[in-house]
């Protein structure tokens, strides 16, 4: 918090301009009117404020708009957007594509942040759907934001959006989201050969039904244990010992280190002990 201090004589800001970069933090707090800042947000981006000064400006806006900023301010946040927390962004109501474009531009080159994920979430909720205009604006959904969308919103994502997805983009997706994304991925990658297909589909397999896992076992994929652990329990428990053996290939030995943890534990409980014994790994059902 910045202490409340009176603005020194002659320092009261009449507009947002470059002279403010010479103001100390307490002077910015005392001499810049929050309402003035809100109406002239578009100028902030052109001024090389320090991060500390930006903190003060954010604080002033927070005081003026405790329920969340209006879109007229949000659209012109510029680099101040990088100071926002997901909690701040959840208070916003973003409906303009221009606002979304402006803030995504600010974030360009940065790692996909929780802030941007929350922004897209707010935008889609504000619009009520993931419409064609939105997808066009985003150039399809930026893959890093997929997990910030609800399963209902993800159902509008075209299979073409799936091509750019990297494994880390799906790290925060829950099973319900993967249930929606997996069939799209299967469709997107359907014309690839066995090994290439597996490389692409691997990250989405948390949404795969039992039948597809069985089919995958026919292609010598040698699934690693990390991928196996991400499979849905419901899909996994239907697999036989022979099918898991074929699915994991030489990685079958890694089941031993995971036998006390879900989903491996759940799968083991569903198998006949005699079948597990034949694996020769000392696994207990």
């Amino acid at each position: 918090e910045v202490e409340k201090t009176a603005c020194p004589s002659g320092k009261k800001a009449r507009e947002i301009d470059e002279s403010l970069i010479f103001y100390k933090k307490w002077e910015l707090e005392a001499c810049v009117d929050a309402a003035l800042l809100a109406t002239q947000m578009d100028r902030v981006n052109a001024i090389p404020f320090t991060y500390e000064q930006l903190d003060v400006l954010k604080h002033k806006l927070d005081e003026l708009y405790p329920q969340g900023y209006p879109e007229s301010v949000i659209q012109h946040l510029g680099y101040l957007f990088l100071k926002m927390s997901p909690e701040d962004i959840r208070k916003w109501n973003v409906t303009s594509l221009e606002t979304l474009k402006a803030l995504l531009e600010v974030n360009k080159g940065h790692e996909m942040s929780p802030q941007v994920a929350t922004l897209i979430d707010r935008f889609v909720k504000g619009r009520g759907q993931l419409d064609k205009d939105t997808l066009d604006t985003l150039g399809d959904i930026p893959p890093g934001y997929l997990c910030s969308l609800s399963p209902e919103e993800l159902s509008s994502v075209p299979p073409s959006s799936i091509w750019a997805v990297r494994p880390q983009d799906l790290d925060t997706c829950d099973p319900r989201q993967l249930d929606v994304l997996y069939p799209k991925a299967r469709l997107a990658f359907q014309n690839m050969n066995g090994s290439e297909y597996f490389v692409k589909i691997q990250s989405f397999l948390g949404g795969a039904p039992t039948e597809d896992l069985r089919a995958l076992s026919q292609h010598n994929v040698s699934m690693d244990i990390a991928t196996f652990k991400r499979l849905q329990v419901d899909s996994l428990v239907g697999l036989s010992v022979a099918e898991v053996q074929k699915l994991l290939g030489p990685n079958i030995v890694d089941l031993k280190t995971e036998e006390d943890k879900s989903p491996v534990r759940d799968w083991l409980f569903r198998q006949h002990q005699k079948d597990l014994d034949r694996l020769g790994l000392g696994l207990q059902g």
């Epitope: 039904p209 069985r214 010992v241 074929k246």
Partner: antibody, heavy 117, light 107 residues
Framework: EVQLVESGGGLVQPGGSLRLSCAAS????????MSWVRQAPGKGLEWVAT????????YYPDSVKGRFTISRDNSKNTLYLQMNSLRAEDTAVYYC??????????WGQGTLVTVSS | DIQMTQSPSSLSASVGDRVTITCRAS??????LNWYQQKPGKAPKLLIY???RLHSGVPSRFSGSGSGTDFTLTISSLQPEDFATYYC?????????FGQGTKVEIK
């Protein structure tokens, strides 16, 4: 006890069609991939087709691809093999087999298909 | 396609004999090798899967070994009911293929 009973075999002319059926019992049919394997008179075994448990995926060797179609009706616990453009070399006993991962673990008694003019 | 070659094609043996049948794959199939027994006019029956695992109900006189491309089925003490034709099958790569069979006859 797993039971597989094939039917539908018989004599057919070259170029003709035939549909084989396999009635399954004693296990949860909808949980298993199923296959057809054939054996020409006095010869060895040849895998002909496999279908996934839900019917989404099918697999064939080149020798029958485009001519044979495997299908299933899980509500009736029945597996089918539609054979078109039959040739003399398709003459064989056709076995229905349950397929588990990489193993044909249970087999029916077979049905003879003879392709001859 | 992976070619499976069995040897011998046939053999004559007596009850109580130790019998060995070999199966060679044209490329590495790991341990995805199964053995089946077929008697005249009957359907094949699974004996051994994954090279050495006995299917339920199969007597312990049957055993399997090998890895990669070379595999062996051994009957430690041949019984009258063992006279039959034996087939190996690779389950590593589609299309799944069988050996041409080895007929075990009474000497």
């Amino acid at each position: 006890e797993v039971q597989l009973v094939e039917s539908g075999g018989g004599l057919v002319q070259p170029g003709g069609s035939l549909r084989l059926s396999c009635a399954a019992s004693g296990f949860t049919f909808s949980d298993y991939f199923m296959s057809w394997v054939r054996q020409a008179p006095g010869k060895g075994l040849e895998w002909v087709a496999t279908i996934s448990n839900g019917g989404t995926y099918t697999y064939y060797p080149d020798s029958v691809k485009g001519r044979f179609t495997i299908s299933r009706d899980n509500s009736k616990n029945t597996l089918y093999l539609q054979m078109n453009s039959l040739r003399a070399e398709d003459t064989a006993v056709y076995y229905c087999a349950r397929f588990d991962g990489y193993i044909f673990d249970y087999w029916g008694q077979g049905t003879l298909v003879t392709v001859s003019s | 396609d992976i070619q499976m070659t069995q040897s011998p094609s046939s053999l004559s043996a007596s009850v109580g004999d130790r019998v060995t049948i070999t199966c060679r794959a044209s490329q590495d199939i790991s341990n995805y090798l199964n053995w089946y027994q077929q008697k005249p006019g009957k359907a094949p029956k699974l004996l051994i899967y994954y090279t050495s695992r006995l299917h339920s109900g199969v007597p312990s006189r049957f055993s399997g070994s090998g890895s990669g491309t070379d595999f062996t089925l051994t009957i430690s003490s041949l019984q009258p009911e063992d006279f039959a034709t034996y087939y190996c099958q690779q389950g590593n790569t589609l299309p799944y293929t069988f050996g041409q069979g080895t007929k075990v006859e009474i000497k």
